[in-house]
Amino acid sequence: YYGCPSECTCSRASQVECTGARIVAVPTPLPWNAMSLQILNTHITELSESPFLNISALIALRIEKNELSHIMPGAFRNLGSLRYLSLANNKLQVLPIGLFQGLDSLESLLLSSNQLVQIQPAHFSQCSNLKELQLHGNHLEYIPDGAFDHLVGLTKLNLGKNSLTHISPRVFQHLGNLQVLRLYENRLTDIPMGTFDGLVNLQELALQQNQIGLLSPGLFHNNHNLQRLYLSNNHISQLPPSIFMQLPQLNRLTLFGNSLKELSPGIFGPMPNLRELWLYDNHITSLPDNVFSNLRQLQVLILSRNQISFISPGAFNGLTELRELSLHTNALQDLDGNVFRMLANLQNISLQNNRLRQLPGNIFANVNGLMTIQLQNNQLENLPLGIFDHLGKLCELRLYDNPWRCDSDILPLRNWLLLNQPRLGTDTVPVCFSPANVRGQSLIIINVNVAVPSVHVPEVPSYPETSWYPDTSSYPDTTSISSTTELTSPVEDYTDLTTIQVTDDRSVWGMTQAQSG
């Protein structure tokens, strides 16, 4: 293109992109009609006064990933049409006052991933049209009152990955149009009452990875439009009874990685839109009746890696839409036969890594759609007659790492397993633990002549007499067993506007390698 600086490329006459280490100053002359200018990965260290004076039609300016550490106050003079400005990924420590003066059209300002140590009210006082402000990944230790008071149209504010230790309750009070507020990965220990009261249009609040210990009871009471609330990886030890009472739009709530010891009935809700609840990696010891009963649309409930030893029979009341229930890596020894009775739509349950000694015969009685059951690494010696018989969709059952007692009482279970071998997977098969002479042998193919007759009174219903060698013609064709529906890996909290981290922690879900993809 005629007019395109020699060290730049122009994919269109009005769109200039200048990249490369050989560039040490803003290229000149720039085309007078330039609408976008990108200066990326250069060795520019400073912006002088008015380097863009002759390109007043500029709409978008990206100066990213440079060595930029110093900007003169008048660097952006005469850019009254500028709507998008990014100074991200540079080495800025200080912003001159008045830098953004005259940028009357500015809508998006990206200052992320610099080394800014402070911002002042005067920095943004001229930016009345600003809708998005990204300040994440800097070294901010505090936000002064009034810093955002003039940004009444702001809809997104990202302050994540800074060094904030406290927030003034007045700092967000004028941001009535704010929809997204991100404060993740700071050093916040508490949030003063009233901090979010002015944010009546807030849809997402990201507070994960701080050091928050206590939540004020009415902290979210004015945020009726909140849809996503991230509180994970903090130090929260208890939830005030009314903390979530006025969040009818909430559809995602993360509380994993805290210090919660108990959940009181009614703590969640009413939240008719909540689809997922993440509570793994806490210190929960028991689940009382009706603790989740307001969550009528919940589909995913993750309670793994806690210390749950008791689940009340009505703990899961109301969860008629639940698809996934993760209870693995807890301290469960016994389960009431009715505990899962209300979970008519449950598809996947993980109970591995507990201390379950036995299961009631009716434990899965009403859960006809179960597709995967994880029971490995418990204390199971046998299972009740017919416990899985009605589960026509069951395609994955994990039973290994249990101390199976291979006396004659085990034969019905063995025969069922023989018929349903494809459902057990190929990774690890259940093996006998006792008697000693068959220890380590596969439960499915134990030698009949070695097995010892039962001499104890069984704790489970007695089985009808079953042949040692079932008719092999009734083996299901392994190709017809549908593989389990792949569980979605849990999506971690947002870390910034451009990245979502996906946890690869299969132990949270209790997934096998094959399932997790």
Epitope: Q15, M35, Q38
Partner: antibody, heavy 120, light 110 residues
Framework: QVQLVQSGAEVKKPGSSVKVSCKAS????????ISWVRQAPGQGLEWMGG????????NYAQKFQGRVTITADESTSTAYMELSSLRSEDTAVYYC?????????????WGQGTLVTVSS | QSALTQPASVSGSPGQSITISCTGT?????????VSWYQQHPGKAPKLMIY???NRPSGVSNRFSGSKSGNTASLTISGLQAEDEADYYC??????????FGGGTKLTVL
């Protein structure tokens, strides 16, 4: 090669909302404008608005202001167009389109289109 | 943001040349050299044929050319071929940083 793949056809009731997705592959997603253009049956093309994903804020045609919301998820390279308060005249094929520069003054790449039918 | 004005239809015989006009205002066509032309076959997505008034993307035949005078842009197709039969749309950048299309022209190859 840049590809834009859109979500499937939708049938909606008047007064409801529809959200159409557009997944981009084969090139940088964040630093190019994604625009949405619709075409009613037998009618011409109509620009609805656009977004530069890295900058987050969308620009809308006056006609659709307040009724359309365009968003982008950089982590999945997906843009979305949500149209609310649907009426029968919103029945159309909705296209996402992308240019070759930060600001789209023209559109080199188009999605396959998503038919949205609004009917009671 | 009124649509740019195009003739509803034009026609021509194979081998002939045709021109499609696109009239706007000083706020769009007349104010910027950012006029584009698209070809659309039935049931298909539009295809960019001309950008910035007169530039052709790679792969587009040199039988297609564009020009502009004042508030009116034009698309000329020379050596008309059967496969050129389609709808053609002009598009311009506007003063309020948005985009406006023409109403479309149906080209019939006789």
């Amino acid at each position: 090669q840049v590809q834009l793949v859109q979500s499937g056809a939708e049938v909606k009731k008047p007064g409801s909302s529809v959200k159409v997705s557009c997944k981009a592959s084969g090139g940088t997603f964040s630093s190019y404008t994604i625009s949405w253009v619709r075409q009613a049956p037998g009618q011409g093309l109509e620009w609805m608005g656009g977004i530069i994903p890295m900058f987050g804020t969308a620009n809308y045609a006056q006609k659709f202001q307040g009724r359309v919301t365009i968003t982008a998820d950089e982590s999945t390279s997906t843009a979305y167009m949500e149209l609310s308060s649907l009426r029968s005249e919103d029945t159309a094929v909705y296209y996402c389109a992308r240019g070759v520069a930060l600001l789209a003054t023209d559109f080199d790449y188009w999605g396959q289109g998503t038919l949205v039918t609004v009917s009671s | 943001q009124s649509a740019l004005t195009q003739p509803a239809s034009v026609s021509g015989s194979p081998g002939q040349s045709i021109t499609i006009s696109c009239t706007g205002t000083s706020s769009d066509v007349g104010g910027y050299n950012y006029v584009s032309w698209y070809q659309q076959h039935p049931g298909k997505a539009p295809k960019l044929m001309i950008y910035e008034v007169s530039n052709r993307p790679s792969g587009v035949s040199n039988r297609f050319s564009g020009s502009k005078s004042g508030n009116t842009a034009s698309l000329t197709i020379s050596g008309l071929q059967a496969e050129d039969e389609a709808d053609y749309y002009c598009q311009s950048w506007t003063h309020d940083n948005s985009v406006v299309f023409g109403g479309g022209t149906k080209l019939t190859v006789l």
